[in-house]
Interface confidence: low
Amino acid sequence: ARILRAPESHNVTFGSFVTLHCTATGIPVPTITWIENGNAVSSGSIQESVKDRVIDSRLQLFITKPGLYTCIATNKHGEKFSTAKAAATISIAEWSKPQKDNKGYCAQYRGEVCNAVLAKDALVFLNTSYADPEEAQELLVHTAWNELKVVSPVCRPAAEALLCNHIFQECSPGVVPTPIPICREYCLAVKELFCAKEWLVMEEKTHRGLYRSEMHLLSVPECSKLPSMHWDPTACARL
């Protein structure tokens, strides 16, 4: 197997879409698989076409974290396997901006994924660090939820409430609209009581370097950094 066109590395903004191309040839026509950070690609769309002994594979991704994407072309001559690899990195420009920047506005939640969790007509904080805050934050919830994959029935509603209230934070309107973070106690209850096993899995992933923890914290809060309801009951939101 021989790679004719290797995927290209990209430096993109958070919430962008990227299409990675990989073209290979060989006799017989090779198969192409994509690897993300050492594992099979868990999300994204793969399209393939074969013409004149050339296979073209396109992986389209919604970028919420940096990663190393490897295209592996394999074919088999008799008992012998032939493999070719090519890799590309996806890095995120200004990836920490949404964390640091509190610029945004209050608006009624009009999305779908958090409909059952957020109060009807809830005022949420939309972060103007994103080009399209509603769409970006909505997709961020989806992506974060995919990270949880298989969760227990006990964890699911608690995690859903935590994610939705963290990404679509309650908004305090005023001259400077302000997001109201979740109270530390509620975050800890989800982490240590309802979703202890699941949380461990996510932290394990972070330690293994599968994604930068700062990026990861955009979707799952770091409980210790949240305000306590005992300090100021109005400074944080209760789930």
Epitope: V12, V18, T19, S45, Q47, Q60, L61, F62, A131, E135
Partner: antibody, heavy 120, light 106 residues
């Protein structure tokens, strides 16, 4: 060969709802995202929204409050409902297949289009 | 919303000549761009996706190029059946189309 066919009333009264159905043949409706796109006479194309059979959907923000999409997998059909229509909703309505899987893509198969006129 | 701007609005070309159509995005869309051809009374037909990949069954005289915000569709040798309206469409965020370029016989 994938084929899409739109059907529905050609005339709708203002303030009422426009309802269209798209019948897909030559492909399983469960395998792709499916979109609705419209084109007012002599003008450009406007994407209305799309859905996947699992219930995941995305809508054009400017139309979102008025749009509902549904699917009948047993008939390999999907539908569009646009409420509170005005004369500005008069257009040729197309159904189309989204060529990519999970994320937005290009539209590789289209229906022939059906003209909907909003008039009293 | 990502706004797509096409130019020129009308392009007058003689059969056998080369036609170059431009499309500009209001922000970077990487290579998430498609081109369509539409003839009167017909649905659009996909020509190019991912900015430069020809769709199935599209003749080699159609080619696409560009990335980021500037894109070009080139028809190397115009045939009589190529006179139509051409639209670009981005799919980096929710899909939006350009206003179209009409390619007419000179």
């Amino acid at each position: 060969q994938v084929q899409l066919q739109e059907s529905g009333p050609g005339l709708v009264k203002p303030s009422e709802s426009l309802s269209l159905t798209c019948t897909v043949s030559g492909d399983s409706i469960s395998s792709y995202y499916w979109s609705w796109i419209r084109q007012p006479a002599g003008k450009g194309l406007e994407w209305i929204g799309r859905f996947y059979t699992s219930g995941r959907s995305n809508y054009n923000p400017s139309l979102k409050s008025r749009v509902t999409m549904a699917v009948d997998t047993s008939k390999n059909q999907f539908s569009l409902k646009l409420s509170s229509v005005t004369a500005a909703d008069t257009a040729v309505y197309y159904c189309a297949r989204d060529g990519f899987g999970s994320y937005f893509g290009s539209f590789d198969y289209w229906g022939q289009g059906t003209l909907v006129t909003v008039s009293s | 919303e990502i706004v797509m701007t096409q130019s020129p609005a009308t392009l007058s070309v003689s059969p056998g000549e080369r036609a170059t159509l431009s499309c500009r995005a209001s922000q970077s869309i990487i290579s998430n761009l498609a081109w369509y051809q539409q003839k009167p009374g017909q649905a659009p037909r996909l020509l190019i996706y991912d900015a430069s990949t020809r769709a199935a069954g599209i003749p080699a005289r159609f080619s696409g190029s560009g990335s980021g915000t500037e894109f070009t569709l080139t028809i190397s040798t115009l045939q009589s059946e190529d006179f139509a309206v051409y639209y670009c469409q981005q799919y980096n965020k929710w899909p939006t189309f350009g206003g179209g370029t009409k390619v007419e016989i000179k």
